[in-house]
């Protein structure tokens, strides 16, 4: 008789999850020689230890602390790019602007990007059938707690001018319920961070509105200002042109781009 298994509302663990994490770790250490001495098997053991045999609705930041001990990777604190609802462009940007880093450019972010995982209470099995959905099941699930933990630490590490890329096509350009709005904004350290600079990315080709005047951006400005951090905002009217100018800043048509 098959053992009863909890059915969750979200998709199950990404297939070949252990192999994927291990392979990503090895690839990362090859791409980033400053991490060449990292033992990826130990990284996987710590990752696994955070959620295996634990109830997937009862995961805490404490469960990830052994793994977080690896998170002392030295990303330049003044070269951090946060993003909300516009991951692909943010990653395209840091692939070109090699001295800036999103969370997914760090080892831990790189390992987990776009993956889902969960275990089962009291068994060493990984659940490939279903995992808890943040809204329908519980917020303290392995994936959500992981991203909350690494996002908090990433924001805490930031200094000087911090940039954030926001999606100007969404009804809420700044969303208080996003990871950026609920975690990162509140964990920037005012004694280290001088300015948060928002880059609002326009979607429509003919969209010439000043989205920095959007009510949600004003709300973000208010939250940041109350935390004694300066706020600035720039419209990126043509993201394709923006990326092109990052690649070729000497292009004469790029004077007005960041």
């Amino acid at each position: 008789v098959p053992r009863w298994r909890q059915q969750w509302s979200g998709p199950g663990t990404t297939k070949r999850f252990p192999e994927t994490v291990l392979a990503r770790c090895v690839k990362y250490t090859e791409i980033h020689p400053e991490m060449r001495h990292v033992d990826c098997q130990s990284v996987w053991d710590a990752f696994k230890g955070a959620f295996i045999s634990k109830h997937p609705c009862n995961i805490t930041e404490e469960d990830y602390q052994p793994l977080m001990k690896l998170g002392t990777q030295t990303v330049p604190c003044n070269k951090i790019l946060l993003w909300s609802r516009i991951k692909d462009l943010a990653h395209q940007f840091t692939q070109v602007q090699r001295d800036m880093f999103t969370l997914e450019d760090t080892l831990l972010g790189y390992l987990a990007d776009d993956l889902t995982w969960c275990g089962e209470f009291n068994t060493s099995k990984i659940n490939y059938q279903s995992c808890p959905d943040w809204r329908k099941d519980c917020s303290n699930n392995p994936v959500s707690v992981f991203w909350k933990t690494v996002s908090r630490r990433f924001a805490e590490a930031a200094c000087d001018v911090v940039h954030v890329m926001l999606n100007g096509s969404r009804s809420k350009i700044f969303d208080k319920n996003s990871t950026f709005g609920s975690v990162e904004v509140h964990n920037l350290q005012p004694e280290k961070v001088q300015t948060l600079e928002a880059w609002v990315i326009h979607g429509g080709r003919e969209d010439s509105r000043d989205l920095c005047q959007d009510p949600t951006i004003k709300e973000l400005e208010s939250i940041i200002s109350k935390r004694n951090i300066q706020f600035s905002c720039k419209n990126i009217y043509r993201p394709d042109k923006f990326l092109q100018c990052v690649k070729n800043p000497e292009d004469s048509s790029c004077t007005s781009e960041i």
Epitope: E34, R36, H37, D39, S42, P66, K69, L70, T72
Partner: antibody
Framework: QVQLVESGGGLVKPGGSLRLSCAAS????????MSWIRQAPGKGLEWVAS????????YYADSVRGRFTISRDNAKNSLYLQMNSLRAEDTAVYYC???????????WGQGTLVTVSS | QSVLTQPPSASGTSGQRVTISCSGS????????VYWYQHLPGTAPKLLIY???QRPSGVPDRFSGSKSGNSASLAISGLRSEDEADYYC???????????FGSGTKVTVL
């Protein structure tokens, strides 16, 4: 075969300076991280500093940070260690080492003796 | 005081097996590769083990390395007189942003 030959050691007074060199051959010098490791008389091995390949990033032991500077000249296949504000406790044999792809010190020079004494 | 802890000495008769321990923490051995070096007085140190348990070519298979958690060990089986030397473990340490060595273990063949 890989060869690492250190030079520049000698006797120096406390507070003085010395520049060590390491001539490398037998491998593509510019591709590899390089390090200095030392051994004080009767003591164990102690890592001193490392320098990355490519656009150089430098790493230092707390005991030498701010006093020693590691650098490299890929055109000359040479590694250097500029040692300032020397102290008696810096007395040691200084080894130049090549790092492997997993961070191990694969090849070592024979060492050069630095004595700091008045 | 070394960051990695090794016994100061170890000994065995010819042909015996000797094990040297190396104890650290999550900031060094826990998440990083362990390396072992053999050092004979007056010569350059020699790499014996890298990536916890890998032997460079030319190192006899009498030497083996292992790692578990925050500790590592080096085993020398079939001890020979030429194995008399100082042995050092090493690893990268995140909190120091540099390499750390053990204090060294002197192996004597009785």
């Amino acid at each position: 075969q890989v060869q690492l030959v250190e030079s520049g050691g000698g006797l120096v007074k406390p507070g003085g300076s010395l520049r060590l060199s390491c001539a490398a051959s037998g491998f593509t010098f510019s591709d590899d991280y390089m390090s200095w490791i030392r051994q004080a008389p009767g003591k164990g091995l102690e890592w001193v500093a490392s320098v990355s390949s490519g656009r150089p990033t430098t790493y230092y032991a707390d005991s030498v940070r701010g006093r020693f500077t590691i650098s490299r000249d890929n055109a000359k296949n040479s590694l250097y260690l500029q040692m300032n504000s020397l102290r008696a406790e810096d007395t040691a044999v200084y080894y130049c080492a090549r790092e492997g792809w997993s961070g191990e010190f694969t090849d070592w020079g024979q060492g050069t003796l630095v004595t700091v004494s008045s | 005081q070394s960051v990695l802890t090794q016994p100061p000495s170890a000994s065995g008769t010819s042909g015996q097996r000797v094990t040297i321990s190396c104890s650290g923490s999550s900031s060094n051995i826990g998440f990083h590769f362990v390396y072992w070096y053999q050092h004979l007085p007056g010569t350059a140190p020699k790499l014996l083990i890298y990536k916890n348990n890998q032997r460079p070519s030319g190192v006899p298979d009498r030497f083996s390395g292992s790692k578990s958690g925050n500790s590592a060990s080096l085993a020398i089986s079939g001890l020979r007189s030429e194995d008399e030397a100082d042995y050092y473990c090493a690893a990268w340490d995140d909190s120091l942003s540099g390499y750390v060595f053990g204090s060294g273990t002197k192996v004597t063949v009785l």
